[in-house]
């Protein structure tokens, strides 16, 4: 039985050209996290494997940085980065947990800076 829950930063916004941290947290389970995948719609951004460490997909190497923790830092944001992001936790013995974050990249300084994981 899967008892865990994923907490995410939810809906967040950031300015074009800036950076943002996508963060998920798995709680309420003793399952071992073996791998976390970060995906944007159907594109794999990065993998954090418990044994192999981080692997950033080649097409995102220039703009994606691993961490902090199991989170992911997106840099040099463009309006095209607006959309859904998913953290997919592969765990043993529970299975897979998925969290969703919606990022809106805004053209001007109307972006909200209240998200607690955002980089100033």
């Amino acid at each position: 039985m899967m008892t865990g829950t994923i907490e995410t930063t939810g809906n967040i916004s950031a300015e074009k050209g800036g950076s943002i941290i996508l963060q998920c947290h798995l709680s309420s389970t003793t399952a071992q996290v073996t791998q976390v995948n970060w995906e944007q719609q159907d594109q794999l951004l990065a993998i954090c494997n418990a044994d192999l460490g981080w692997h950033i997909s080649p097409s995102f190497k220039d703009r994606v940085a691993p961490g902090p923790g199991l989170g992911l830092t997106l840099q040099s944001l463009t309006v095209n980065d607006t959309g859904e992001y998913f953290c997919i936790y592969h765990t043993y013995p529970d299975g897979t947990y998925t969290g969703r974050i919606f990022l809106e990249v805004l053209e001007s300084s109307v972006a909200e800076h209240g998200a607690r994981f955002q980089i100033p």
Epitope: N49, A50, D51, L52, G53, I56, A65, P66
Partner: antibody, heavy 117, light 107 residues
């Protein structure tokens, strides 16, 4: 006792192919990712490729991407490295190693690959 | 890619000396650094992992420290069997990278 035994090295001409094997024993093979690391004569260590325990994901250094293929047969407790389009700069001792939590805890004795005409 | 800069590239020391080897890496900010010992004609052997954890069977005269971008391997009292080449390695992100090695020679 964990043991890793590489084989398949030898002399090959530039552009040629070679398949290295690494026979593993003394541990539950499919529970561990595995990796290949090479060392050119008189030089330092260079990571080549890694594979997850299931074999479902593989990773490569840019220097070998598209030419080398890592694979494993968990029923035979064996790791492989298929090397194609070999170049002089691929000349090295190739080591297989077991991966555990971001480090390489057991290494084989190595097998020498020489690429020369 | 994360570059691991190891220093010194070589050093001469006597039995009983305290030896320190350092490794620094850009963009690290973690403790996923390991140290290996290699003797001529032999495979590398794991000494330290996660920056400071001693691998099984490794003598307690070896120790590791550091976090973030700078890591250190210390041999508290050099023994004859410790003359070898030592490598650091980062396992935080692929491609894994090694330092260029430090050769510890007899003075």
């Amino acid at each position: 006792e964990v043991q890793l035994l590489e084989s398949g090295g030898g002399l090959v001409q530039p552009g040629g192919s070679l398949r290295l094997s690494c026979a593993a024993s003394g541990f539950t093979f499919n529970a561990y990712p595995m990796t290949w690391v090479r060392q050119a004569p008189g030089k330092g260590l260079e990571w080549v490729s890694a594979i997850t325990g299931s074999g479902g994901s593989t990773y490569y250094a840019d220097s070998v991407k598209g030419r080398f293929t890592i694979s494993r047969d968990n029923s035979k407790n064996t790791l492989y490295l298929q090397m194609n389009s070999l170049r002089a700069e691929d000349t090295a001792v190739y080591y297989c190693a077991r991966v555990w939590r971001n480090h390489l805890d057991y290494w084989g004795q190595g097998t020498l690959v020489t690429v020369s005409s | 890619d994360i570059q691991m800069t190891q220093s010194p590239s070589s050093l001469s020391a006597s039995v009983g000396d305290r030896v320190t080897i350092t490794c620094s890496g850009d963009k690290l900010g973690h403790t996923y650094t390991s140290w290996y010992q290699q003797k001529p004609g032999k495979a590398p052997k794991l000494l330290i992992y996660r920056a400071s954890t001693l691998a099984s069977g490794v003598p307690s005269r070896f120790s590791g420290s550091g976090s973030g971008t700078d890591f250190t391997l210390t041999i508290s009292s050099l023994q004859p069997e410790d003359f070898a080449t030592y490598y650091c390695q980062q396992g935080y992100t692929l491609p894994w990278t090694f330092g260029q090695g430090t050769k510890v020679e007899i003075k």
